[in-house]
């Protein structure tokens, strides 16, 4: 038997994938566990796996369909379920109704590449990744930068108010080693959250031009 | 601004049929769902059917095997095909449509259509 609190929170990345973690307070021996989403109103149910990411906290991705398909949308309610094996049948153990409108994460913005590098400017670009064409342009980005010497909790947030995948950071320190990440959020749902920070995309400023003697 | 007109009610005698219609018009947008909703006096409004992206249609019981909604996307256009019509089934008809308009969704009514059914 399983004792103490648990929590079961579970994002719709808004195309093909929902993703779940399943937090137990209580020490589960080598039990299987699995998520199962069962919607109210398509001919499809689907199961996944949940796998450690740490002590106390599972983990799975609900794949729906090919990544770009638009398999909910606003009115769909899944009924998602935490099953675990106890013997030979299984237990619930978590149950929530989850409406994936109200509850969107999005990938992680992705190809992020320097399209220019200056001594003290670069512009620098990415995709956005499987997002629902509800959303047309508009999202909004975060982006930071690490500089030398500071930690990305240091790093101050630049706020992009519309889908504008580029940016030009400016005011940099020539000849210096940088990296730079961006996230994305639709407007969209009362417990939305950003996505996932991308992958951090490493330049180098151009070295200044040496001054002539005075 | 965005426009639902319905169209289609009237009076009918038991065992009839009767085909209702919604246009959506205005502004920008993209319709995730539209569907049919029923009041009856003294009632709250509930759905009798609805069709969201990717042909999910959802009925209530009593109307299954007796009506069926059709949505044409391309048209911003949702039908309602009602036969074997009952005297139960008269009410103000509403139409409904779930729009996203600038990345937030909202839902939108129409001013409904009278059926009359008369036994």
């Known amino acids: 038997a399983v004792n103490g609190t648990s929590q079961f929170t579970c994002f719709y990345n808004s195309r093909a994938n929902i993703s779940c973690v399943w937090s137990q307070d209580g020490a589960l021996q080598d039990t299987s566990c699995q998520v199962h989403a069962w919607p109210d109103r398509r001919r499809w149910n689907q199961t996944c796996e949940l796998l450690p990411v740490s002590q106390a906290s599972w983990a799975c991705n609900l794949i729906l369909g090919a990544p770009d398909s638009q398999k909910l949308t606003t009115v769909d309610i899944v009924t998602l379920r935490v099953l675990c094996r106890e013997g030979v049948r299984w237990r619930v153990m978590a149950i929530q109704d989850f409406k994936p409108f109200e509850n969107l994460r999005l990938m992680a913005p992705i190809s992020l590449q320097v399209v220019h590098v200056e001594t003290h400017r670069c512009n620098i670009s990415w995709e956005i990744s499987q997002a629902s064409h509800y959303f047309e342009r508009h999202l909004e980005f975060e982006a930071r930068t690490l500089s030398p010497g500071h930690t990305w909790e240091e790093a101050p947030l630049l706020t992009l108010k519309q889908k504008q995948e580029w940016i030009c950071l400016e005011t940099l320190t020539p000849d210096t080693q940088y990296e730079f990440q961006v996230r994305v959020k639709p407007l969209q749902g009362e417990f939305t959250t950003w996505s996932p920070w991308s992958q951090p995309l490493a330049f180098r400023t151009k070295p200044a031009a040496l001054g002539k003697d005075t | 601004q965005v426009q639902l007109v319905e169209s289609g009610g009237g009076l009918v005698q038991t065992g009839g049929s009767l085909r209702l219609s919604c246009a959506v018009s205005?502004?920008?947008?993209?319709?995730?769902?539209m569907g049919w909703y029923r009041q009856v006096p003294g009632k709250q409004r509930e759905l009798v059917a609805d069709?969201?992206?990717?042909?999910?249609?959802k009925y209530a019981d009593s109307v299954k095997g007796r009506f069926s909604i059709l949505r044409d996307s391309a048209k911003n256009t949702v039908y309602l095909q009602m036969s074997s019509l009952k005297p139960e089934d008269t009410g103000i008809y509403y139409c409904?449509?779930?729009?996203?308009?600038?990345?937030?969704?909202?839902?939108?009514w129409g001013q409904g259509t009278q059926v009359t059914v008369s036994s």
């Open positions: 205005g502004s920008r947008f993209i319709s995730d769902v």
């Open positions: 409904k449509a779930g729009l996203w308009i600038a990345g937030r969704h909202s839902d939108y």
């Open positions: 069709m969201a992206d990717g042909g999910s249609a």
